[in-house]
């Protein structure tokens, strides 16, 4: 902490401006009155105050605002946001999604630090849900943001977001995600047409059970190989040798290569030999 | 990949101006801050100042100021350091760099300088 | 300013033998300190920044520590290509300050 001192004549700041770059961090704490420097927080992130900087007008903001910032100087943060922590953090109440966008740049390019998953967690319960706005502001910055939802969060995500959902976003969902996904999903597309349906459902599949796996397969959709071993392997088990023939269509052939792994090599030991024989491929069950 | 390219070297009068350019590629050119710092023969760095491309916000070193004009020119990403009433203790290496993360002022990237020799 | 003293203005040290290099600030500077590796007619390349973080491809041989005042760069098992001046660099505070130099080289 930076010890009080007397500001030397004729610095102390009127104003928040470039000048005060060159302040060191005790005439910072001195010449810089608190309540002028949060009337003016949109000035601070237009000058490069260096992080050791930044400490001083933090504590400032501290001691001013002990019980949490307002949002009025919450979205002018910029990169103080980075000396923020997760407990200054928990006593925001953020409801403007372009003060978390402002957060969020601040952050860009970096992996989710606690202090983010702190602003988003305060932010999406403020708000009560996650809504397609949001979603879309969050895996805009974060891909992998929806995977690092508990199923009981997901549970809050209304259908209508999905929309807002890219495949890539889902990569490192695991099963027991995309079971909270996959109704949602189907009820967000169920208007579309065959193949543009195929098209959106298709990164959700992993949630899909058997019964919507066996409509699929009759609607000529040509799974791809990895979509298929994304499958839920008790959804796949079911599914007899023509079901399957049907749901991958040419990609068949590429079960040959994937006969030792899950779901196929189980689903290959609970069907007839008979029944792979007559797809061609050599697979032992 | 980042690229900063500066003009080539200048011999000036006591008295006279020079000014070096520093063209800049493989990254936004508005995104960041241009800083000069010169090198006198033998000696160590300096830092003169900075330039934001996007807003041409300008702040200088104490010691230049007055004599240093830092500009930009958007369209060809290129970015000026003039320096006026040049002195024989001016002569020097100049170079331009780069901070990307401005709250860590470290200088990321640099040209490969321009000699200016101030002499009668 | 923030005045940033380098000692020893040069240095001769055997291939493989360690090199160190100490700088002092006039301030607290807390851990804000770059050292820069520069080679003969090259510019300066960015070694460490936070006192002790190496920058992207810097071999492991480079190590940068201290805190407040005190800095020291050192090279473990100096090599031939490591023959250059090395500048600290404060950024606590603007302006931003250098140490005068180290010239580094093989004994």
């Known amino acids: 902490e930076v010890e009080k001192t007397a500001c030397p004549s004729g610095k102390k700041a009127r104003e928040i401006d470039e000048s005060l770059i060159f302040y060191k961090k005790w005439e910072l704490e001195a010449c810089v009155d608190a309540a002028l420097l949060a009337t003016q927080m949109d000035r601070v992130n237009a000058i490069p105050f260096t992080y050791e900087q930044l400490d001083v007008l933090k504590h400032k903001l501290d001691e001013l605002y002990p019980q949490g910032y307002p949002e009025s100087v919450i979205q002018h943060l910029g990169y103080l946001f980075l000396k923020m922590s997760p407990e200054d953090i928990r006593k925001w109440n953020v409801t403007s999604l372009e003060t978390l966008k402002a957060l969020l740049e601040v952050n860009k390019g970096h992996e989710m630090s606690p202090q983010v998953a702190t602003l988003i967690d305060r932010f999406v319960k403020g708000r009560g849900q996650l809504d397609k706005d949001t979603l879309d502001t969050l895996t805009a910055f974060y891909p992998g943001y929806l995977c690092s939802l508990s199923p009981e969060e997901l549970s809050s995500v209304p259908p209508s977001s999905i929309w807002a959902v890219r495949p890539q976003d889902l990569d490192t969902c695991d099963p027991r995600q995309l079971d909270v996904l996959y109704p949602k999903a189907r009820l967000a597309f169920q208007n579309m047409n065959g193949s543009e349906y195929f098209v959106k459902i298709q990164s959700f599949l992993g949630g899909a059970p058997t019964e919507d796996l066996k409509a699929l397969s009759q609607q000529n959709v040509s799974m791809d190989l990895a979509t298929f071993m994304k499958l839920r392997t008790d959804a796949v088990l079911p599914l007899t040798v023509a079901e399957v023939q049907k749901l991958l269509g040419p990609h068949v052939e590429g079960l040959k290569a994937e006969e030792r792994h899950r779901p196929v090599r189980d689903w290959i030991l609970r069907q007839r030999q008979d029944d792979l024989d007559t797809l061609g491929l050599g697979l032992q069950g | 990949q980042v690229q900063l390219v500066q003009s080539g070297a200048e011999v000036k009068k006591p008295g006279a101006s020079v000014k070096v350019s520093c063209k800049a590629s493989?990254?936004?050119?508005?995104?960041?801050?241009m800083h000069w710092v010169r090198q006198a023969p033998g000696q160590g760095l300096e830092w003169m100042g900075m330039?934001?491309?996007?807003?041409?916000?300008?702040i200088y070193y104490e010691k230049f100021q007055g004599r240093v004009t830092m500009t930009v020119d958007k369209s060809i990403s290129t970015a000026y350091m003039e320096l006026s009433r040049l002195r024989s203790d001016d002569t020097a290496v100049y170079y331009c760099?780069?901070?990307?993360?401005?709250?860590?002022?470290?200088?990321?990237?640099w040209g490969q300088g321009t000699l200016v020799t101030v002499s009668s | 300013d923030i005045v940033m003293t380098q000692s020893p203005d040069s240095l001769a040290v055997s291939l493989g033998e360690r090199a160190t290099i100490n700088c002092k600030a006039s301030h607290d500077v807390g851990t804000s300190v770059a050292w820069y590796q520069q080679k003969p007619g090259q510019s300066p390349k960015l070694l460490i920044y936070?006192?002790?973080t190496r920058h992207t491809g810097v071999p492991d041989r480079f190590t940068g520590s201290g805190s407040g005042t005190d800095f020291t760069l050192t090279i473990s098992s100096l090599q031939a290509e490591d023959v250059a001046v090395y500048f600290c660099?404060?950024?606590?505070?603007?302006?931003?300050?250098f140490g005068a130099g180290t010239k580094l080289e093989i004994k």
């Open positions: 660099q404060q950024y606590s505070s603007y302006p931003l300050t």
């Open positions: 493989g990254y936004t050119f508005t995104s960041y801050y």
């Open positions: 936070w006192a002790s």
């Open positions: 760099a780069i901070i990307i993360t401005p709250v860590v002022p470290k200088f990321d990237y």
């Open positions: 330039i934001h491309p996007n807003s041409d916000n300008t």
